[in-house]
């Protein structure tokens, strides 16, 4: 049994880091493998992660961590029974993938304006709380070419757009994702999408 693709890990900068790797053949990850991880810090204790299958030869493990800061560095040991398959390290602050925003809502009761709001996925005491920016994706269910991205570079988790910038009388969907420039993070996953029917009064033409 060998590791074909070494583990790569990303942190949500809150409580979970996710590591993925591939074995050289079909593997029952949860019964055959264990990923041990330990913070390089005085008094820290080793923890064991039981991986799950992620495709035939792929494995994924969700590592539980406390508050993450730049100083944190973890040793990682991948074991198959008594055999050490791979040894490495992981610095969560250098591999951050933010949590996806939630509770995306489209408010259509404002006159001819669409107000999209969502929730910041972090609590106020987390460093990323005040450092997220967002991308909002809006697309038409009827017309695949009607697909647009709005970059939200301010802190407030909301976006206002004129309803008239979208076609009237058809259904649209929206989703939102986040990233943080301060840590040069990857983009989060998209939030679940929300659907609404866009209708507004056309301006009266003489």
């Amino acid at each position: 049994m060998k590791v074909l693709q070494e583990p790569t890990c990303v942190s949500d900068y809150m409580s979970i880091s996710t590591c993925e790797w591939k074995m050289n053949g079909p593997t029952n990850c949860s019964t055959e493998l264990r990923l041990l991880y330990q913070l390089v810090f005085l008094l820290s204790e080793a923890h064991t992660c039981i991986p799950e299958n992620n495709g035939g030869a792929g494995c994924v493990c969700h590592l539980l961590m406390d508050d993450v800061v730049s100083a944190d560095n973890y040793t990682l040991d991948l074991w198959a029974g008594q055999q050490l398959l791979w040894k490495g390290s992981f610095k969560p602050s250098e591999h951050v993938k933010p949590r996806a925003p939630g509770n995306l809502t489209v408010h259509t009761n404002v006159s001819d304006t669409l107000l999209l709001t969502w929730s910041n996925p972090y609590p106020p005491d987390n460093y990323l709380y005040n450092h997220l920016t967002y991308a909002v994706n809006i697309w038409s269910e009827n017309d695949p070419a009607d697909f647009r991205i709005y970059n939200v570079t301010y802190l407030e988790p909301s976006l206002r757009i004129a309803a008239s910038t979208l076609k009237s009388g058809i259904s649209y969907r929206a989703r939102v994702r986040a990233w943080a420039q301060c840590y040069n993070t990857t983009w989060s996953e998209w939030s679940p999408s929300t659907k609404w029917h866009n209708s507004y009064r056309e301006p009266f033409e003489q």
Epitope: F41, D66, S70
Partner: antibody, heavy 116, light 111 residues
């Protein structure tokens, strides 16, 4: 919110021992390390040691090795710092502080006076 | 005896900017991260800066931290009378057991 409530002021004679308590609330007690530091009157901060409330393991500053003992009671989310063989130079405010690399939250401090 | 050296005192007028230095060595600041603590008169210390330059929630952006080599600096802009306090830098000793260490402390007086 996070709160660290320390026991009240103590007056001790040289050679005696003192045990200061620090009751934690507002977070998962066993998930965060607890440090102890002290500050003599008009002096700076001095780190004394750290305890991992999860397993109870400890690490002490060399200066206090053999004189200090840190323990915890997970049932009451309380950590204790006991300092023995007290001398007048141990007169100080003793602080517990939650954190790992950084000391995020501090107790209000416990004044220990050593006087004959 | 702290191995992190700070000036004993600094002073400036309200509205001005002040900096406080913290000098260490390769086995502490040079190979780790720096924090800063504010201790108002008669109170416990409070974390002001961690990871060299990050502020915990609730700390105004008038406070900023930086690190270069084996030294670190705390800068306070738009000085207010309420900023009058003792300030301590902190890091840990990488040569032994990662034990935390504090600076000697700096008394800030707002004139």
């Amino acid at each position: 919110q996070v709160q660290l409530v320390q026991s009240g002021a103590e007056v001790k004679k040289p050679g005696a021992s003192v045990k200061v308590s620090c009751k934690a609330s507002g977070y998962a007690f066993t998930s965060y390390y607890m440090h102890w530091a002290r500050q003599a009157p008009g002096q700076g901060l001095e780190w004394m040691g750290i305890i991992n409330p999860s397993g109870g393991s400890t690490s002490y500053a060399q200066k206090f090795q053999g004189r200090v003992t840190m323990t915890r009671d997970t049932s009451t989310s309380t950590v204790y710092m006991e300092l023995s063989s007290l001398r007048s130079e141990d007169t100080a405010v003793y602080y517990c502080a939650r954190g790992k690399w950084w000391l995020y939250n501090w107790g209000k401090g416990t004044l220990v006076t050593v006087s004959s | 005896q702290s191995v992190l050296t700070q000036p004993p005192s600094v002073s400036a007028a309200p509205g001005q900017k002040v900096t406080i230095s913290c000098s260490g060595g390769s086995s502490n600041i040079g190979n780790s991260y720096v924090s800063w603590y504010q201790q108002l008169p008669g109170t416990a210390p409070k974390l002001l800066i961690y990871d060299n330059n990050k502020r915990p929630s609730g700390i105004p952006d008038r406070f900023s931290g930086s690190k270069s080599g084996t030294s670190a600096t705390l800068a306070i802009t738009g000085l207010q009378t309420g900023d009058e306090a003792d300030y301590y830098c902190g890091t840990w000793d990488t040569s032994t057991t990662y034990h935390p260490i504090f600076g000697t402390g700096t008394k800030l007086t707002v004139l």
